[in-house]
Amino acid sequence: ALDAAYCFRNVQDNCCLRPLYIDFKRDLGWKWIHEPKGYNANFCAGACPYLWSSDTQHSRVLSLYNTINPEASASPCCVSQDLEPLTILYYIGKTPKIEQLSNMIVKSCKCS
Amino acid sequence: ALDAAYCFRNVQDNCCLRPLYIDFKRDLGWKWIHEPKGYNANFCAGACPYLWSSDTQHSRVLSLYNTINPEASASPCCVSQDLEPLTILYYIGKTPKIEQLSNMIVKSCKCS
């Protein structure tokens, strides 16, 4: 799996999980989240060569098509596969509220 | 939706469905498929600017992050959303066989 265990341990130009820390205030302009101040969002990036973690029949076909037609612009792309939620604390006036924001953290990637 | 109805009618630099015809023999080297000779596989391509058809909370966050941090390399990517199967005819010896290959045709795209 193209997850932290594999990607953060290997120098990988191909599609892999990349570390990205997002500071809510500085990077998103969000002042409303009290805790955490930021989080490890991560992101997916890198080349998708022939059959590198292809996720559907179509991406495998496209991968093969690119190998035979290297001048073609139709190639798979490195995107998130597994995502996890993030629990945040914010205030409604003086009242604290805990909320779970879905699909905020990328855990693994795929070529799609 | 970033589908044929929208994308094939508009000239769109941003993430959209693109037409792609694949000839099984010529483009994939597959000689085993008898019918069809090829099919409209389509593919997804184009830029994913700020919140253009972002598909998850993470891709929306990443999109906002890129707007505020334009020098960042962490940006969403244009990939397939809805896929459809393709029915093919091939032969095992002299015996014809009909098979449905799943996820062969891209019908719409998203920024992920």
Epitope: G29, W32, Y91, K94 | Q57, L64
Partner: antibody, heavy 120, light 107 residues
Framework: QVLLVQSGADVRKPGASVKIFCKAS????????MHWVRQTPAQGFEWMGS????????TYARRFQGRLVLTADTSTNTAYMELRSLKSADTAVYYC?????????????WGQGSLVTVSS | DIVLTQPPSLSVNLGQTARITCRAS???????LAWYQQKPGQAPKLVTY???SRAPGIPDRFSGTNSGITATLTISGARAEDEADYYC?????????FGQGTKLEIK
Amino acid sequence: QVLLVQSGADVRKPGASVKIFCKASGYTFSSNVMHWVRQTPAQGFEWMGSVIPIVDIATYARRFQGRLVLTADTSTNTAYMELRSLKSADTAVYYCARTLGLVLDAMDYWGQGSLVTVSS
Amino acid sequence: DIVLTQPPSLSVNLGQTARITCRASQSLGSSYLAWYQQKPGQAPKLVTYGASSRAPGIPDRFSGTNSGITATLTISGARAEDEADYYCQQYADSPITFGQGTKLEIK
């Protein structure tokens, strides 16, 4: 500069619904919380609720809960306020307003207002 | 809900100091109150917020204080263009509430 442009005046019958839009420009729409406030001569200003773009967290005043829906379309930088089961007492000028940053906060920019008249 | 009480009207001479008060039904803390100015046919305009912050573009003759229960908007050397309705707003608790407004007349 920051601009919040709202939809025009509307006349509705009792029991109907109204949907008002608020198109934002001049700032990063997804970074700020958007509020909806209405004003009537009888009640003055009444806060209706707020919505946080991207994460779609909506907070509603108790008295509007169940018939108010606040949404934000980040692709078009537009906030929407839909009020259902309208009564004549809902005749008011409706404003969208951006907050300084917190969920409940001072409102630094306001739309021009949308007059909604509920009459049979 | 927190109730905010303001005097319905206030009249001051041109160049004099105007003090508009806003009394809360319970303590807000010093940082949860804002003042708005509204002129006929216009949307409200933020004047002060928090403990004593002035909104951008607001002249320094406007100042706000807040003890927690009673907040005061002070206009030192009132001008003709300051004639308007002034509203206080609390954001310490949901729902946000507003005062009924004070009509300021400049004589």
